[in-house]
């Protein structure tokens, strides 16, 4: 996968101090790169703002669960 070699790496250096309502969240992605100082979750809000959050916090894990369950393929 040569294209990924020089791909830019997004890192989080600080985490949000406040809990974000799940109604404001649209998606998330995880950051695990060894080039970053810490593992992180980046939430994208419904207004396309990106927010770094601590994956060890329960509200962050609950929010990720909520987003994943929200997008389950409906049973026919």
């Amino acid at each position: 996968q040569p294209d990924a070699i020089n791909a830019p790496v997004t890192c989080c250096y600080n985490f949000t101090n406040r809990k974000i309502s799940v109604q404001r969240l649209a998606s998330y992605r995880r950051i695990t790169s060894s080039k970053c100082p810490k593992e992180a979750v980046i939430f994208k809000t419904i207004v396309a703002k990106e927010i770094c959050a601590d994956p060890k916090q329960k509200w962050v894990q609950d929010s990720m669960d909520h987003l994943d369950k929200q997008t389950q393929t409906p049973k026919t």
Epitope: S27, R30, T32, Q61, M64, D65, L67, D68
Partner: nanobody, 124 residues
Framework: EVQLVESGGGLVQAGGSLRLSCVAS????????MGWFRQAPGKEREFVAA????????TYADSVKGRFTISRDNAKNTVYLQMNSLKPEDTAVYSC?????????????????WGQGTQVTVSS
């Protein structure tokens, strides 16, 4: 560097059981949802089961519901797949993966860091 190593596959007769294990390293395991997928020769990768970081929420493919159980031991950085009442159509290479993006648990693009897989063969 994130690494996933599966084990526990093998040859089993129809109706038998196997327990697969996937050991993860290089990440804070307990904060990641994990999934099991399988791929049979000539077929697309198929979702089997997934579990959230804390182990409180699981989801299964219809084809394995009631027969397979996914679980995890965060102290051992390991996710398991207990497979009972195996059928010949369960024959495939089984791989675990780390969920990295929001979206349906059953969607492979939501996952990254795939293990090399372990072969499960069910004979009739």
């Amino acid at each position: 560097e994130v690494q996933l190593v599966e084990s526990g596959g093998g040859l089993v007769q129809a109706g038998g059981s196997l327990r697969l294990s996937c050991v993860a390293s290089g990440l804070t395991f307990s904060t990641y949802s994990m999934g099991w997928f399988r791929q049979a020769p000539g077929k697309e990768r198929e979702f089997v089961a997934a579990i959230n970081g804390g182990g409180s929420s699981t989801t299964y493919a219809d084809s394995v519901k009631g027969r397979f159980t996914i679980s995890r031991d965060n102290a051992k950085n390991t996710v398991y797949l207990q497979m009972n009442s195996l059928k010949p159509e369960d024959t495939a290479v089984y791989s675990c993966a780390v969920k990295m993006y929001s979206g349906s648990y059953s969607s492979p693009p939501g996952y990254n860091y795939w293990g090399q897989g372990t072969q499960v063969t069910v004979s009739s």
